[in-house]
Amino acid sequence: APTSSSTKKTQLQLEHLLLDLQMILNGINNYKNPKLTRMLTFKFYMPKKATELKHLQCLEEELKPLEEVLNLAQSKNFHLRPRDLISNINVIVLELKGSETTFMCEYADETATIVEFLNRWITFCQSIISTLT
């Protein structure tokens, strides 16, 4: 059984991941630029199921495409540095799901926009945090 300290650590890591994803989404929503239309044409794979930490494998596999899309948004009004941001998220994801995981991600048939993708993983973090609180 997980100790209270390990649960606390997991909760904190999930909160960090949640905030990072919310920061990205906020940056995109604030982004009044023709580039936004182009960003929305990129398609992301969504997990068929995302209810456990091991399912973060599906997020990890989409971090590179996410970085590429965020690179489009670079301007003085977009305050997230994609390389730093994705690196930070990757570290958290690895710690949460465990780097030794052999879980094979299953994706849904339908792809999603960056906004739908971020909202899905934000909801994932929120639901797991709620069970830990």
Epitope: L12, H16, L19, D20, Q22, M23, L25, N26, N29, H79, L80, R81, D84, L85, S87, N88, I122, Q126, S130, T133
Partner: antibody, heavy 113, light 107 residues
């Protein structure tokens, strides 16, 4: 104990900039993201934005985008909030808060010609 | 942005009274709601997080309930030190938003 100590009150002229500091102590600085919230006299609370203290990236409320810059100095466990092109309606108490349960004492910024 | 609407905006009560403040979100925020107490010239103080969890050191006379769009802060027996302004806040999505506040005054 865990605390956030902010810089002192400021009086600025319209069009000027102000930089408020918030020094953290009693906890690992990079553990909690830092939010900035302001409160105009007799008014409610207004979220301005957030900074990730480890990586330094930020996200701002649309209302302040283009005028606000949040930075951090990990060597001194200090976060900064700079607001430019000040106008009279920016007169407010500015708070930093870490994890929402720890708040700075507030910094009164008065904008007056 | 998610709008948070508190009611009433002010109320008068006596020591020992049961006080209820409500907060409504413009869309569902699950239980991503916090309540703060603020006294004049002081920073807000977290009372309740996750809609119903009491922050450490907060007296048990304070309680929170609700989920989705409707939330309640209850003070079971008002004490002299409870006269203050109370704010609800959602952190379900950015931008974080607050209710306009409820001022609890002495009757």
């Amino acid at each position: 104990q865990v605390q956030l100590v902010q810089s002192g009150a400021e009086v600025k002229k319209p069009g000027a900039s102000v930089k408020v500091s918030c020094k953290a102590s009693g906890y690992t600085f990079t553990t909690y993201y830092m939010h900035w919230v302001r409160q105009a006299p007799g008014q409610g609370l207004e979220w301005m934005g957030i900074i990730n203290p480890r990586a330094g990236y930020t996200s701002y409320a649309l209302k302040f985008q283009g005028r606000v810059t949040m930075t951090r100095d990990t060597s001194t466990s200090t976060v900064y909030m700079e607001l430019s092109s000040l106008r009279s309606e920016d007169t407010a108490v500015y708070y930093c808060t870490s994890g929402w349960d720890v708040w700075g004492q507030g910094t009164l910024v008065t904008v007056s010609s | 942005d998610i709008q948070m609407t508190q009611s009433p905006s002010s109320l008068s009560a006596s020591v020992g009274d049961r006080v209820t403040i409500t907060c409504r979100a413009s869309q569902s925020i699950s239980t991503w709601l916090a309540w703060y107490q603020q006294k004049p010239g002081k920073a807000p103080k977290l009372l309740i997080y996750a809609a119903s969890s009491l922050d450490s050191g907060v007296p048990s006379r304070f309680s929170g309930s609700g989920s989705g769009t409707d939330f309640t802060l209850t003070i079971s027996s008002l004490q002299p030190e409870d006269f203050a302004t109370y704010y609800c806040q959602q952190s379900y999505s950015f931008p974080v938003t607050f209710g306009q506040g409820t001022k609890v005054e002495i009757k």
